[in-house]
Interface confidence: low
């Protein structure tokens, strides 16, 4: 069937339109175009005879039409009057005629719109504003934008006049925004420039800052006032009802008790004519006395005495506060406060209770601190320590031992050998020792104030032969890439060389291996699984040597990224799927499987008999090592094909 298609259907003035003919019959004599829905000689635009390829203009020809051999008609420089129907009359060679009608619409290119307003400075909660989109244009649609968003749903927003007018009832400060209007027709869309709505509002109730209402005599008073307002508010200050100044800030230096009273800030908006006030009551306090601490025991004995600290002076209706080490009092059954908090009692003092202690008197405004007080707690002596820690010495060297015990006042020291008193000094020195100097060396520490004494005994061996050493470790199960391990060769011996072997080889050069403490300590930083070897230490001097038993390092590692085998990812329907997962790990990891994210079983092997295309998906193996706290996983895609096809295995 003969049809006419208009391209485009909606045409802008000045543009062109093509009336495209479809299903043109064969064996044509010619054709003719008419304006309107029927063949009317008075409204003929153009005729065309195929044999002569001759086009003949008709009465309705405007000079803007071009007819093509395929009967299509192009109309250029479209005007408004071109809107409507167009009829094609086709004359076939057998003189049987056919007709078809098409149509298009013409619309003007819209001008850029603008916004007019009936009120440029509306007052909040009082005025309405009507925006109108200019100019008024026929067959145009009007749209509105607020801050480049479409209009919000609000009972205060009303569209009228075919959406050309936007009315905001009872404007608020939140209506201060960018407004745009847009005109649209089927061939164009234009948006106006922004119009900013300037809503007059306020002043709101002013706020006075800072909020602080209590001051100390001698301080400066600096109050600031602010009220939300458009245009900005004008401010006035009143003290006890008396006008002070017309500023936003009020400053009074070096205030006294006489400056106590009510302070009023008044905010005024000259455009809205509104006033709002806020009142704050300021209280100025006199300076209180500085407190100090008294103690009932200036030299208490550790674990025996109690100490009562009292905050002076005593003032009625006053709050007393305490601090220890610049912190508020810790919760402790050994700390007790009196009912008025003025006395702090320390029950059974310890050496850690030295302080410093401070007390404070709190008035309405601030807290005044005392000077700090430190307790002289008598303690000790603790068990003395004898240094150096060597227990083996070679004959002929000098023996020099030193003793120390924590004590207040400092301890007095005595030395005994095999129970016999030697001397009353902190250090014991014996030159050119022999095997006869072997024995029990005792240090006794005495506190003259508490009368307490403590002793420590050390066995000293003088011998040319070295003992069999042993290895101690600070970490028996280090985690790979995380922990360090320190091996120490025991015992500590004087004038002795320490040696180390790993798997029977001398130490390799490595930035992760470090010798210290006279080569007596071997530290492995950031251990790896390759460090799980046998370590041996040796000691030697000029007359003997000895080796320790080996110590094997048990490094926890993994799990590494698992490997799923076999590597095949394509299977035929009906086959058995047997996937095995393996991950290097110490200790052995726990395994679990997920298919398409759904947990399956906690085994190393996943077996599914007689798989089908329903078993397509992602197969994930998860491994976790409870000792290292680490996890790992790998995902494999499995494709199952119907039995008739033979897919190639993918890598």
């Amino acid at each position: 069937k003969l049809t006419i298609e208009s391209t485009p259907f909606n045409v802008a003035e000045g543009k062109e339109v093509l009336l495209l003919v479809h299903n043109l019959p064969q064996h044509l004599f010619g054709y003719s175009w008419y304006k309107g829905e029927r063949v009317d000689g008075n409204r003929q635009i153009i005729g065309y005879v195929i044999g002569t390829q001759q086009a003949t203009p008709g009465p309705a020809y405007s000079g803007r039409e071009i007819i093509y051999p395929n009967a299509s008609l192009l109309i250029q420089n479209i005007i408004q009057n071109d809107t409507g129907f167009y009829t094609l009359h086709v004359i076939k060679s057998d003189l049987v005629n056919e007709e078809a009608t098409g149509q298009f619409r013409v619309y003007p290119e819209l001008p850029k719109p603008s916004i007019s307003s009936n009120n440029s400075k509306p007052v909040e909660d009082k005025d309405a504003v009507a925006f109108t989109c200019e100019p008024e244009t026929q067959d145009a649609t009007y749209l509105w934008w607020v801050n480049n968003q479409s209009l919000p749903v609000s009972p205060r927003l009303q569209l009228s006049n075919g959406n050309r007018t936007l009315t905001l009832f009872n404007v608020t400060r939140n209506d201060t925004a960018s407004y745009k209007c847009e005109t649209q027709n089927p061939v164009s869309a234009r948006r106006s420039d922004s119009v900013i709505l300037n809503v007059l509002y306020g002043p709101d109730a002013p706020t006075i800052s800072p909020l602080n209402t209590s001051y100390r005599s001698g301080e400066n008073l600096n109050l600031s006032c602010h009220a939300a307002s458009n245009p900005p508010a004008q401010y006035s200050w009143f003290v006890n009802g008396t006008f002070q100044q017309s500023t936003q800030e009020l400053f009074i230096p070096n205030i006294t008790v006489n400056n106590s009273g009510s302070y009023t800030c008044q905010a005024h908006n000259s455009d809205t004519g509104l006033n709002r006030t806020t009142v704050t009551t300021i209280t100025v306090y006199a300076e209180p006395p500085k407190p100090f601490i008294t103690s009932n025991n200036s030299n208490p004995v550790e674990d025996e005495d109690a100490v009562a600290l009292t905050c002076e002076p005593e003032i009625q209706n006053t709050t007393y506060l305490w601090w220890v080490n610049n912190q508020s009092l810790p919760v402790s059954p050994r700390l007790q406060l009196s009912n008025d908090n003025r006395t702090l009692t320390l029950l059974s003092v310890t050496r850690n209770d030295v302080g410093p202690y401070e007390c404070g008197i709190q008035n309405e405004l601030s807290v005044d601190h005392s000077d700090p007080v430190i307790l002289n707690v008598l303690y000790g002596p603790d068990d003395p320590t004898i240094s150096p820690s060597y227990t083996y010495y070679r004959p002929g060297v000098n023996l020099s031992l030193s003793c120390h015990a924590a004590s207040n006042p400092p301890a007095q020291y005595s030395w005994l050998i095999d129970g016999n008193i030697q001397q009353h000094t902190q250090e014991l020195f014996i030159s050119n020792i022999t095997e006869k100097n072997s024995g029990l060396y005792t240090c006794q520490a005495n506190n003259s104030a508490s009368g307490h004494s403590r002793t420590t005994v050390k066995t000293i061996t003088v011998s040319a032969e070295l003992p069999k050493p042993s290895i101690s470790s600070n970490n028996s199960k280090p985690v790979e890439d995380k922990d360090a391990v320190a091996f120490t060769c025991e015992p500590e011996a004087q004038n002795t060389t320490y040696l180390w072997w790993v798997n029977g080889q001398s130490l390799p050069v490595s930035p992760r291996l470090q010798l210290s403490n006279g080569n007596r300590t071997l530290t492995l930083f950031n251990v790896t699984r390759n460090d799980a070897r046998a370590y041996v230490c040796g000691i030697q001097n000029s007359v003997s040597a000895n080796r320790s038993d080996p110590v094997t390092l048990d490094v926890l590692y993994g799990p590494d990224t698992p490997i799923i085998s076999p590597p095949d990812s394509s299977y035929l329907s009906g086959a058995n799927l047997n996937l095995s997962c393996h991950s290097a790990s110490n200790p052995s990891p726990q395994y679990s499987w997920r298919i398409n994210g759904i947990p399956q079983q906690h085994t190393q092997v996943l077996f599914i008999a007689k798989i089908t295309p329903n078993n397509n998906g992602t197969y994930a193996c998860f491994v976790s090592n409870l000792a290292t706290g680490r996890n790992n996983s790998i995902v494999k895609s499995i494709t199952v094909s119907a039995s008739g096809t033979s897919p190639g295995l993918s890598a």
Partner: antibody
Framework: EVQLVQSGAEVKKPGASVKVSCKAS????????MNWVRQAPGQRLEWMGD????????SYNQNFKGRVTITRDTSASTAYMELSSLRSEDTAVYYC??????????WGQGTLVTVSS | EIVMTQSPATLSVSPGERATLSCRAS??????????IHWYQQKPGQAPRLLIY???NLETGIPARFSGSGSGTEFTLTISSLQSEDFAVYYC?????????FGGGTKVEIK
């Protein structure tokens, strides 16, 4: 922050080979597959292949008929792509891309390879 | 291999307008409920940047005006309100089967 830094631009003659490197940082190199994608002028992006840095396993686009080889050096956290038997149509920007969430999550800055006689 | 077809080749849009880009796969790229299709943005002289993964998941740091939808073989990338920095070429990628393949791209240009 994940970063992939590629080697500089190369000019090669037809028949020669080119090897582009991609150094990774900001994540564990062996945990994620590394892919290579190229983009010839005016053409769509074309996936060339990938490597699992942990075990060295590779997959390739058969359109390259065995001309592409992808390798890695885990100690240097670096992946390499070598393309042999170069022809003029191999002129392209070559990208490395880290594989995550079933897609190319992070890309290198690209390396321009020009093949010209 | 799976052939990815994007349309239109060029899309002219004004800033603030909505843009809708299409991507069609020659066969299904879904597997067990997951759509293995991803969208990338590329600007001149830069590497592609991942916007959407698994058809509809927004990559970290990508603005919410980008969204993806679709399943099976038909997928759509939508930019709700185009910003100046969004004018670029957009590619879809399928990772359902090796070789992974990209669409020919849609260039989004300023109208």
């Amino acid at each position: 922050e994940v970063q992939l830094v590629q080697s500089g631009a190369e000019v090669k003659k037809p028949g020669a080979s080119v090897k582009v490197s991609c150094k990774a940082s900001g994540y564990t190199f062996t945990d994620y597959h590394m892919n290579w994608v190229r983009q010839a002028p005016g053409q769509r992006l074309e996936w060339m292949g990938d490597i699992n840095p942990d075990i060295g396993g590779t997959s390739y686009n058969q359109n390259f008929k065995g001309r592409v080889t992808i390798t890695r050096d885990t100690s240097a956290s670096t992946a390499y792509m070598e393309l042999s038997s170069l022809r003029s149509e191999d002129t392209a920007v070559y990208y490395c891309a880290r594989w995550d969430f079933d897609s190319f999550a992070n890309w290198g800055q690209g390396t321009l390879v020009t093949v010209s006689s | 291999e799976i052939v990815m077809t994007q349309s239109p080749a060029t899309l002219s849009v004004s800033p603030g307008e909505r843009a809708t880009l299409s991507c069609r796969a020659s066969e299904s790229v879904s597997i067990i409920g997951t759509n293995l299709i991803h969208w990338y943005q590329q600007k001149p002289g830069q590497a592609p940047r991942l916007l959407i993964y698994h058809a509809s998941n927004l990559e970290t740091g990508i603005p919410a005006r980008f969204s993806g939808s679709g399943s099976g073989t038909e997928f759509t990338l939508t930019i709700s309100s185009l910003q100046s920095e969004d004018f670029a070429v957009y590619y879809c990628l399928q990772s359902r089967k090796i070789p992974y393949t990209f669409g020919g791209g849609t260039k989004v240009e300023i109208k």
